[in-house]
Interface confidence: medium
């Protein structure tokens, strides 16, 4: 507990002090007082630097004095032999004796008193910025007129803050301008304009005189402008170092003027005004702004129209323009909207073809479609090159978005048939020689693939089975091999309307219009072993002459087997119809004269016993295209015959081309 005075005596005083003692006394007087310590008696063993025995006076970590030896007063009227005065309210006295004393020493006697200190004069650092007033136990600071004492109760400043300027134009100056501004002040001014206007500050060079920066470039006094998260300054020195006009891009500006304790500079004066908030004029190579202006400000509205091939990214799909308003914050409304290149997306894939992966799917990009050659060719779409158009579609050279169509190449066998003779009397064949050859398993018969969805065959093949199962792509029709070949399922069977349906088909003598179409459920995939045969053209070039050669193939009866399990083929010449008429019908169902011969039939064969026979029905009689020697067309279909190994009759397909095309068109798969 602090006391105003007290006495301190060495151990055993006034008797001799003991050896090997260390004792300390903590003196504390009230706050605001110093301590005056008086020694009235001193008798301590003398040694150099008082190393043996001593009394030490400490103020914190600072040694105020160290005493030893004998002292007597110089003043006969006063007992004081030594004194110490400190301006602090705490002091420590420490007494120490060593292990031996050669003589008897009595030690010391001392007392202390609390003394007033003059804070205004006793310290190196002045406690007050302006006026210091001492009193017993303390001091207080005061200020000159127009100054006020800050909350720290030590510093005086000018009351220059709190002004809010809302007028669209105005002038602000430092306190006392153009007289020197007060030291040790922080002046804050606020400019608050209505939204949509930005504060523009103008400071003329000659209107600015603020204490210059120190040697390290730090402003001692400074003027700072703060607008939102941007700061202009700090500024100081003679002559304004900033730009003539400061465009703050904000309707709110705080002006902060901070001064230190010294200086005699005149300060500053500024003008401000509110400009409608500008919005940035953007460089937009992908759009056009209407109206076009050198500068856009608050409340301006522009229509942004995307250039051809560009579109608005967000918002309505496919929008090509939008409106934008210059907002009070200096930002455009709809700023998220941008004109970006139209994206056509990944090109659509096509059946039996592919597209080159475009480098990009944006406006102007190019891709190329190709068909799976050599089995398909492009029916439309020119050379297959498409580009991403401004409407977001991939279009061809004709600017049509219609996708290319890959259609099967017809009539081209992957390997030409080379019969060992010129399927009775025929040779072994490979399905690659006759990729159009279709196998019907019930009844055992043939057909010709003419399109990915259509098989042409003889009417008598399908009249008893309206849901035939067919196979393509296999040379062998053995059960074990067929399981691995491509099975085709029929969707619908179209028998020519001219084919007469009989109660007892076995008794048939009229095979006129022996032609039918089978529509398939699913499209056939073309390849080296599966391809369609062409239809005959309608021109006279496709009229068959006697002696013209055609190829037949099938799995029908041969000399050796009732059913050939491997494909057989033969090349036969066209013969006059009378040749077929002249052959005696084997096991006739009726009188020979009852058998009907019509112009819808082709007679062929008669050479070296080569002929089609049971099980070959519906297969193609394939003739080389007169206008393209690489291709074959289906001139006939195996229909009937008087006797295997002689002449055979084939349905003349040329007479049915219109019916075939019409049926396929009317029943086309979407």
């Amino acid at each position: 507990e602090p006391t105003m005075y007290g006495e301190i005596l060495s151990p055993n005083y006034p008797q001799a002090y003991p050896s090997e003692v260390e004792k300390s006394w903590d003196i504390e007087v009230p706050e605001g007082y110093g301590i005056h310590l008086y020694f009235t008696h001193l008798d301590i063993e003398l040694s150099e630097n008082c190393a043996y025995d001593s009394v030490q006076i400490m103020s914190g970590d600072t040694e105020e004095g160290r005493l030893c030896g004998q002292r007597t007063s110089n003043n006969p009227h006063s007992p004081i032999v030594e004194e110490f005065q400190v301006p602090y309210n705490k002091l420590q006295v420490i007494f120490k004796s060593d292990f031996s004393n050669e003589e008897r020493f009595t030690g010391f006697a001392a007392y202390y008193v609390a003394t007033d200190i003059n804070e205004c004069t006793d310290f190196v650092d002045a406690p007050c910025s302006h006026f210091c007033n001492n009193f017993i136990g303390g001091y207080f600071c005061s200020c000159p007129p127009e100054y006020f004492l800050h909350d720290d109760m030590k510093n005086c400043g000018v009351n220059c803050s709190g002004d809010v300027f809302t007028a669209l134009i105005g002038e602000i100056a430092s306190p006392n301008y153009p007289k020197p501004y007060p030291e040790n002040s922080r002046c804050e001014y606020q400019i608050r304009l209505e939204k949509g206007f930005q504060v523009v500050v103008t400071v003329r060079r000659e209107d600015f005189d603020v204490e210059p920066a120190d040697s390290e470039g730090n402003c001692l006094d400074s003027l700072v402008f703060v607008a939102g998260d941007q700061q202009f300054g700090p500024y100081c020195g003679r002559g304004f170092p900033g730009p003539l006009n400061i465009e703050t891009k904000s309707n709110a500006l705080d002006i902060i003027f901070q001064t230190d304790l010294t200086g005699q500079n005149k300060g500053w004066k500024l003008r401000y005004h509110g400009d409608p908030m500008p919005c940035p004029k953007e460089e937009t190579p992908t759009s056009v702004w209407e109206p076009a202006k050198a500068k856009y400000v608050f409340k301006d509205v522009v229509r942004i129209t995307c250039l051809d091939g560009f579109e608005v990214v967000e918002g309505r799909v496919g929008a090509t323009s939008f409106h934008s308003t210059c907002q009070s914050n200096g930002k455009w409304s709809n700023s998220k909207l941008k004109c970006q290149p139209v994206d056509c997306g990944i090109p659509e894939s096509i059946e039996n073809g592919k597209f080159e992966d475009p480098e990009s799917t944006l406006f102007g990009s190019v891709t190329r479609y190709t068909c799976e050659e050599p089995y398909y060719y492009m029916e439309n779409g020119g050379n297959g090159q498409y580009h991403c158009a401004s409407n977001g579609s991939w279009v061809n050279e004709a600017l049509s978005p219609e996708l290319p169509k890959c259609v099967p190449v017809c009539g081209v066998p992957r390997e030409p048939f080379e019969g060992k003779q010129r399927i009775i009397g025929g040779s072994d064949a490979d399905i690659k020689n006759f990729p159009w050859q279709v196998f019907f398993d019930n009844p055992w018969a043939g057909g010709a693939l003419i399109d990915e969805y259509w098989v042409l065959t003889a009417a008598h093949v399908v009249e008893g089975n309206q849901e035939p199962t067919m196979y393509v792509g296999s040379t062998s029709v053995q059960t074990s091999r067929l399981a691995k070949s491509k099975m085709l399922t029929s969707e619908r069977v179209f028998i020519h309307p001219g084919w007469k349906l009989l109660e007892v088909p076995e008794a048939r003598t009229n095979f006129d219009n022996d032609i039918a179409l089978v529509q398939l459920k699913d499209p056939v995939k073309m390849g080296p072993t599966v391809a369609p045969i062409c239809l005959p053209g309608t021109s006279s070039d496709y009229n068959l002459m006697d002696g013209d050669l055609g190829l037949i193939a099938g799995w029908g009866r041969t000399e050796k087997r009732d059913r050939a399990l491997r494909l057989k083929a033969a090349m036969l010449p066209v013969a006059p119809l009378r040749k077929c008429r002249e052959v005696k019908v084997e096991n006739p169902k009726a009188d020979a004269g009852a058998y009907v011969f019509t112009p819808n039939m082709i007679c062929a064969g008669g050479e070296k016993g080569m002929d089609s026979c049971k099980g070959d029905s519906g297969g193609a009689f394939a003739v080389q295209d007169p206008n393209d020697k690489t291709k074959f067309y289906v001139a006939g279909l195996v229909s009937w015959g008087p006797q295997c190994g002689t002449y055979g009759l084939y349905t003349r397909v040329q007479n049915y081309v219109d019916w075939i095309k019409k049926t396929m068109q009317e029943n086309s798969t979407p």
Epitope: D428, D441, N442, P443, W444, G464, S476, V477, Q478, T479, S480, L482, P505, E506, R557, K560, R561, D562, R563, L565, R566, E586, N587, K614, Q643, C644
Partner: antibody, heavy 119, light 111 residues
Amino acid sequence: QVQLVQSGAEVKKPGASVKLSCTASGFNIKDDYIHWVKEAPGQGLEWIGRIDPADGHTKYAPKFQVKVTITADTSTSTAYLELSSLRSEDTAVYYCARYGYGREVFDYWGQGTTVTVSS
Amino acid sequence: DIVMTQSPDSLAVSLGERATISCKSSQSVDYEGDSYLNWYQKKPGQPPKLLIYDASNLESGVPDRFSGSGSGTDFTLTISSLQAEDVAVYYCQQSNEDPWTFGQGTKVEIK
């Protein structure tokens, strides 16, 4: 389903003739081939021959060329085997069979007809 | 004519044991990589039943303990685990060339 039904057992005197029938159902006889096979007592199986009912075209094993005649009537879906100049060695069970699809086999058989030649 | 010879003429095998029948032809019954050799099972009072076609293909509905192998002139029918209902006469038959011919048959019995 496919079925071949044969005529009943026959007992004949030597020198006589006999005509066995085989009626097909479940398939169209004119689209197929009907074969005949002999099984003599204590002997194995022997192929006799076949017919294409659509045109009556026949093939015979050389051994039976003279002995047998195979015919067919598509209107009744029936095939016939006629044995002439019967002798005791003609005593056997005679089977008709259908020629298989996609493999060179007999896939369906009749139940067999027993012919006994005895004086 | 192609002559087909089976061996043995008869075979007695314990139930569950393997039975193997051999069939040799006087000339090859192969054509373009396929063997036209079939196996039939014949039980008394019943028509023959197709087991194996084209030398090694199992006919639909036939138990898989029956298997066939071979090519050219040498063929084998194997019953991997003989069952009581397998007692019968087994015939091989070639269908590569007219006339179609059968082997003399092999009788399989239970030991």
